[in-house]
Amino acid sequence: YDFTNCDFEKIKAAYLSTISKDLITYMSGTKSTEFNNTVSCSNRPHCLTEIQSLTFNPTAGCASLAKEMFAMKTKAALAIWCPGYSETQINATQAMKKRRKRKVTTNKCLEQVSQLQGLWRRFNRPLLKQQ
């Protein structure tokens, strides 16, 4: 999906008011300095591409993020504020239902959500001019 035509300000507002709170809850008890960011993004569409990938694509050691509250709210925000996003996700959602596993917060998941935190932080910044 190409995130270029999303309403970034509306997604930013959704992140600040709700998604961030669920990330805070998920990461509670974890020091902000515990994990270093290894995933970055260069502009808002790129940030959303990376956010979608980390949030909804199962990875080795962390298969369950898509069912977390922050993930569901992320999905809702993208569906509302990114034209045509919902249609692209129907097949992916059906595939995910078949893979559904028990929710377990592993260290790998905490690390992945820490990466998400960094991506959202970068998405959140208004455009910075390169010197």
Epitope: A13, P126, L128
Partner: antibody, heavy 119, light 107 residues
């Protein structure tokens, strides 16, 4: 833990330039934007601008464009603000402050650097 | 630029009281508001971020509320160590802007 250590007080002549530093420790320097804030008794707190250490990207308040230049040195995890063509109006306490973990706020503050501009 | 207005420059309260410090934005800043405390001779300290989240180590007598244009910092059961300046900051859009401080005095 996160610490922002700022350089010591400066006394400089009008018309000169000065470069204040802020050494970050306890976190990955390139992961967080750094902001600079000016505080005076008359104007209170004023946001000067911000820098993304990873890209060198910056943003400034209009008032400080041409007055302040923000830079960052990744190798030493240090952020800088250079102030030029100094006048008595630039006398203030300058703070560096780090972007918050979730964005949309700043969390940790340096101890501040007092700049006095006087002939 | 977005203007943040703290209409109360001074507030006088007694130990054990509850006090509300308010901040009004000139346009919608959603929940991108933080509250800071500054004691004499010290650098500011973060109390509340994203309008209602308490920063690490901040006592639970400090609470933040609001969204859009109207924000409130509530200090319940005021303690003598709460004598300080309090200010809000909007971080929705550059340039980020501070409210004028509210000086809390303890009777």
């Amino acid at each position: 833990q996160v610490q922002l250590q700022q350089s010591g007080a400066e006394l400089v002549r009008p018309g000169a330039s000065v470069k204040l530093s802020c050494k970050a420790s306890g976190y990955m320097f390139t992961d967080y934007a750094m902001h600079w804030v000016k505080q005076t008794p008359v104007h209170g707190l004023e946001w000067i601008g911000t820098i993304d250490p990873e890209t060198g990207g910056t943003a400034y308040t209009q008032k400080f464009k041409g007055k302040a230049t923000l830079t960052a040195d990744i190798s030493s995890s240090t952020a800088y603000v250079e102030l030029r063509s100094l006048t008595s109006e630039d006398s203030a306490v300058y703070y560096c402050t780090r972007e918050g973990s979730y964005g949309g706020y700043v969390d940790y503050w340096g101890q501040g650097t007092t700049l006095s501009v006087s002939s | 630029d977005i203007v943040m207005t703290q209409s109360q420059k001074f507030m006088s309260t007694s130990v054990g009281d509850r006090v509300n410090i308010t901040c009004k934005a000139s346009q919608n800043v959603h929940t991108a508001v933080a509250w800071y405390q500054q004691k004499p001779g010290q650098s500011p300290k973060t109390l509340i971020f994203l309008a209602s989240n308490r920063h690490t180590g901040v006592p639970d007598r400090f609470t933040g509320s609001g969204s859009g244009t109207d924000f409130t910092l509530t200090i319940s059961n005021v303690q003598s160590e709460d004598l300080a300046d309090y200010f809000c900051l909007q971080l929705w859009n550059y340039p980020y802007t501070f409210g004028g401080e509210t000086k809390l005095e303890i009777k």
